[in-house]
């Protein structure tokens, strides 16, 4: 069954945590649907963003942070492991120094920590996708 | 009650026709939600686009056409009559020489015909909005 989109969930992250998302683009890649995952510092959608991950399917991925309301230095990748019309599984793992983004089991993107992952309080998944799975796994202490 | 998004409806347009859309952005303008309205030449989403109207709420509007699979010259406007968090009513009227786009009753954008409006067979409304009304009115002959 489908999860509502935008999908918002409270989350606490630290080294060893993994966010797993399963979904499917709502349009063909020719029409450039988007997927966006934002790790927020508060439960409010207007809060700062520790890690912003935006896919323009078929074209590019941009990653960034929003600090004190201002977007910072954008990181762009043309790597496009997503398949037109196909379901994807996205996992974002918190490593000591960066986020590692896996697409369908393949390491595809990394983003150095700018803000501590412990500052994350909420994850939002949205834009032009249908969402079938969202999970945050925590490292066993 | 809400209409599904993406929302697709068969349509035939000619001078005097008006497409009316009522909806609301799904996110605050800080997060740059999008609205897109596409007038297609076929019932297929990968078909050419006679009129492409995309709002990045709070930032800008772009208009274009997609002809034989290729995007043409983009027209951009910084005019932003949409209100953060507020419902909008959008009406696109087919004039003899152009499309006229009204936002909340105010003439906001125009786009000169590149392809005859009679070539339109389908309208799609999508991206980051909830949709409460979609109507195509035809000029009484």
């Amino acid at each position: 069954s489908l999860l509502p989109v935008p999908y918002t969930e409270a989350a606490s992250l630290s080294t060893g945590s993994t966010v797993t998302i399963k979904g499917r683009p709502l349009a063909c890649f020719l029409n450039e649907p988007y997927l966006q995952v934002d790790f927020h510092t508060e439960m409010k959608e207007e809060s700062d963003i520790v890690f912003h991950f935006q896919v323009c399917f078929g074209r590019r991925v941009v990653m960034n942070s929003r600090e004190y309301g201002a977007w910072k230095q954008q990181v762009e990748s043309k790597n496009m492991p997503f398949q037109d019309g196909q379901e994807f599984e996205l996992s974002i793992s918190v490593l000591p120094d960066k986020y590692q983004v896996m697409v369908n089991g393949q390491s595809s993107y990394t983003f150095d920590h700018r803000i501590k992952p412990e500052a994350v309080k909420m994850v939002q998944v949205w834009r032009d996708i249908s969402l079938t799975k969202f999970n945050v796994s925590y490292l066993k202490r | 009650s809400l209409l599904p998004v993406p929302y697709t409806e068969a349509a035939s347009l000619s001078t005097g026709s008006t497409v009316t859309i009522k909806g609301r952005p799904l996110a605050c303008f800080l997060n740059e939600p999008y609205l897109q309205v596409d007038f297609h030449t076929e019932m297929k989403e990968e078909s050419d686009i006679v009129f492409h109207f995309q709002v990045c709420f709070g930032r800008r509007v772009v208009m274009n056409s997609r002809e034989y699979g290729a995007w043409k010259q983009q027209v951009e406007s910084k005019n932003m009559p949409f209100q953060d968090g507020q419902e909008f009513e959008l009406s696109i009227s087919v004039l003899p020489d152009k499309y006229q786009v009204m936002v909340n009753g105010q003439s906001s954008y125009t786009f000169d015909h590149r392809i005859k409006p009679e070539a339109v067979k389908m309208v799609q409304v999508w991206r980051d909005i909830s949709l409460t009304k979609f109507n195509v009115s035809y000029l009484k002959r």
């Epitope: 004190y68 000591p96 150095d112 920590h113 700018r114 803000i115 501590k116 | -």
Partner: antibody
Framework: QLQLVESGGGLVQPGGSLRLSCAAS????????MYWVRQAPGKGLEWVSA????????DYAGSVKGRFTISRDNTKSTVYLQMNTLKPEDTALYYC????????????WGKGTLVTVSS | QSALTQPSAVSVSLGQTARITCQGA??????GIWYQQKPGQAPVQVIY???NRPSGIPERFSGSSSGGTATLTISGAQAEDEADYYC??????????FGGGTHLTVL
């Protein structure tokens, strides 16, 4: 091995200008943010300016904004600091630094070049 | 007035443990980094990412962070550890900020 060598310091009158250079070697310069940090005699460290890998993003401390300009030439592995309208309070040892990640901080420092602003 | 506050001086007996603190609201959000500066020399990074030691830095140097406080700990302080120590974090990810510095005296 990795080296950052600053040059261009000296004595200048208030209101004057200087251009500092920092020549980098021993690493892929175009992969790193670069920074300038200064230290007034007997005082602590003060960040001055930062520039991203391509030179498109720059940032400045409030005390130098509008007077100082940071730039870089990746073909020469060199970062510059153009200092205009100098004031006596700009007197300091100016260090060039390589930026690692935000997590890693500024991991390598040059030896510094002394700027003295005095009439 | 720096956004990061350090004690101006800390003393420690030879072989004992020295702790230097750095306080600032931004340390709850951004990482703490520590630099050692000896007279007439450029600073050298001794801790990055709150608690990581660069290669070549002795194991007696460690770092931690909790809330708005970062702490540099020197376990079994040696005479050569006498120096000024600066903490550094960020105002935003393009704007570094330094603490005022702490002079460590090894008695």
């Amino acid at each position: 091995q990795l080296q950052l060598v600053e040059s261009g310091g000296g004595l200048v009158q208030p209101g004057g200008s200087l251009r500092l250079s920092c020549a980098a070697s021993g690493f892929t310069f175009s992969n790193y943010w670069m920074y300038w940090v200064r230290q007034a005699p007997g005082k602590g460290l003060e960040w001055v300016s930062a520039i991203d890998v391509g030179g498109g993003t720059t940032d400045y401390a409030g005390s130098v904004k509008g007077r100082f300009t940071i730039s870089r030439d990746n073909t020469k592995s060199t970062v510059y600091l153009q200092m205009n309208t100098l004031k006596p309070e700009d007197t300091a040892l100016y260090y060039c630094l390589r930026g690692g990640s935000y997590y890693g901080g500024m991991d390598y420092w040059g030896k510094g070049t002394l700027v003295t602003v005095s009439s | 007035q720096s956004a990061l506050t350090q004690p101006s001086a800390v003393s420690v007996s030879l072989g004992q443990t020295a702790r230097i603190t750095c306080q600032g609201a931004k340390l709850g959000r951004y990482y703490g980094i520590w630099y050692q500066q000896k007279p007439g020399q450029a600073p050298v990074q001794v801790i990055y990412g709150d608690s990581n030691r660069p290669s070549g830095i002795p194991e007696r140097f460690s770092g931690s962070s909790s809330g708005g406080t970062a702490t540099l700990t020197i376990s079994g302080a040696q005479a050569e550890d006498e120096a000024d120590y600066y903490c550094q974090s960020y105002e935003s990810s393009t704007s570094p900020v330094f603490g005022g510095g702490t002079h460590l005296t090894v008695l």
